[in-house]
Interface confidence: low
């Protein structure tokens, strides 16, 4: 998270962490008690799911494996298109005050929403700095209309922008599959953006949960 | 398959400026990285700085900063390279090569930083 | 700027052998580094990116393996058509960095 600040601790408590061994590999959000929704660009063949701090690699976090995920299959790695996934946990969480799913949209919200967007990924861009906690960024919801005109045809139908005018603030690197929470629902994963990140007024794109809650509840049955 | 295809060679006085050109064909051009990279004869690699299309910024090496210019014509599939106030280092071969593209998920894609190159345009500098 | 040291400058090997280079970023980068060959007169290609996966195409002789300072590109049993020039590059950070080249000659 570029410009950002450190998000109050326990304050998201559906925040998860994919590791990558000890490494971070990208943000995730707890829906279920064994399923994590993250964006479809994280997958690998298995994960190292941190559930319940806002430490990476804090010792007492809850740490569970999955070796399953399942892509939107409509995901395209040139546009970027239904960029969501569902990685489904080895062994069920254990739900605690540290540990809760995240609820699902009723509705999409509309521009001028506020939200806040969290994730460990880089706090600089180009060169990295990686943070031990959680850090958050409080950004809008940006029009469909005004977002084309600066992604022009790479914004799909699905995707979400999120910004705040001549901010920097923005999400980067490391923060992908993480959540975008607008009144308290989950409506965006973080997606993609500019690079270098955090250049003012080129918002950050997200998928937009609520076009997929469909897909989500649909794939959780199939592979109870 | 996607392919680049530059401009052909080059003389040039010292003092001069040169523009190379660098034209994609058969995929998908604007939101792909295009970086330029030089090779002297019979040195190495060298990042000049790069450019996504449908962001039109581009960003430069701190050694060419203010000779360099990178643009690129979304209409043409086109990028160009505008190299100014030549000398005699600057005799080398000019790469376009496509980058990753500008996603920045912890995907691996970013670890491809050149994955398809044109075929080069040298450019000699000599009075 | 991140400096790229690659060792050695260049190499003599025969047929068959296992061929091992080097590179060493100033600091870390993560795992965002490639490989690249380069032959006489021809523009370099990509084997190896995000210092381990193998570019389509590429044989599997190649492997990239490394993450965060120290990098290795190995050919596991070196064929004719692989005598050349080898590069590493990061992509970790701008402006994008490449180490110096090994020369992989016949013994």
């Known amino acids: 998270i570029i410009d950002g600040y450190k998000c109050k601790e326990g304050s998201h408590p559906w925040q998860v962490a994919l590791l990558k061994g000890n490494q971070l590999h990208c943000g995730g959000v707890l829906v279920d008690k064994y399923w994590v929704l993250t964006a479809a660009h994280c997958k690998m063949g298995q994960y190292q799911v941190q559930l319940g701090s806002d430490k990476i690699g804090d010792q007492s976090a809850q740490k569970i494996k999955a070796t399953k995920s399942f892509r939107h299959p409509g995901y395209s790695t040139k546009t970027h298109v239904n960029d969501i996934m569902l990685v489904r946990l080895d062994e069920p969480v254990k739900m605690s005050s540290k540990v809760e799913a995240v609820q699902l949209p009723e509705h999409c919200e509309p521009p001028g929403t506020s939200c806040t967007v969290s994730g460990w990924g880089t706090t600089t861009s180009p060169d990295v700095t990686f943070p031990s906690d959680l850090m958050c960024s409080d950004v809008k919801l940006i029009s469909s209309r005004e977002c084309k005109k600066v992604y022009k045809d790479l914004l799909g139908k699905t995707m979400l922008c999120a910004g705040i005018p001549d901010s920097k603030t923005n999400t980067c690197n490391g923060d992908s599959g993480g959540p975008l929470v607008c009144n308290d629902t989950l409506q965006g994963l973080v997606s993609w953006g500019t690079y270098p990140c955090g250049q003012p007024n080129d918002p950050g794109v997200y998928t937009q949960v609520c076009k997929y809650k469909r897909w989500v509840m649909e794939t959780m049955k199939t592979h109870r | 398959q996607v392919q680049l295809v530059q401009s052909g060679a080059e003389v040039k006085k010292p003092g001069s400026s040169v523009k190379v050109s660098c034209k994609a064909s058969?995929?998908?051009?604007?939101?792909?990285?295009i970086s330029w990279v030089r090779q002297a004869p019979g040195q190495g690699l060298e990042w000049m700085g790069g450019?996504?299309?449908?962001?039109?910024?581009?960003n430069y090496a701190q050694k060419f900063q203010g000779r360099v210019t990178i643009t690129a014509d979304e209409s043409t599939s086109t990028a160009y390279m505008e190299l100014s106030s030549l000398r005699s280092e600057d005799t080398a071969v000019y790469y376009c090569?496509?980058?990753?593209?500008?996603?920045?998920?912890?995907?691996?894609?970013?670890?491809?930083?050149?994955?398809?190159w044109g075929q080069g345009t040298m450019v000699t500098v000599s009075s | 700027d991140i400096q790229m040291t690659q060792s050695p400058s260049s190499v003599s090997a025969s047929v068959g052998d296992r061929v091992t280079i080097t590179c060493r970023a100033s600091?870390?980068?993560?795992?965002?580094l490639a490989w690249y060959q380069q032959k006489p007169g021809k523009a370099p290609k990509l084997l190896i990116y995000?210092?381990?996966s193998l570019q389509s195409g590429v044989p599997s002789r190649f492997s990239g393996s490394g993450s965060g300072t120290d990098f290795t590109l190995t050919i596991s049993s070196l064929q004719p058509e692989d005598f050349a020039t080898y590069y590493c590059?990061?992509?970790?950070?701008?402006?994008?960095?490449f180490g110096g080249g090994t020369k992989v000659e016949i013994k």
């Open positions: 600091q870390g980068i993560s795992s965002w």
């Open positions: 590059v990061q992509a970790n950070a701008f402006p994008y960095t």
């Open positions: 058969g995929g998908t051009f604007s939101n792909y990285a």
């Open positions: 450019i996504i299309p449908i962001f039109g910024t581009a």
């Open positions: 090569a496509r980058g990753a593209p500008n996603y920045y998920g912890s995907s691996s894609s970013r670890g491809i930083a050149f994955d398809i």
């Open positions: 995000a210092a381990s």
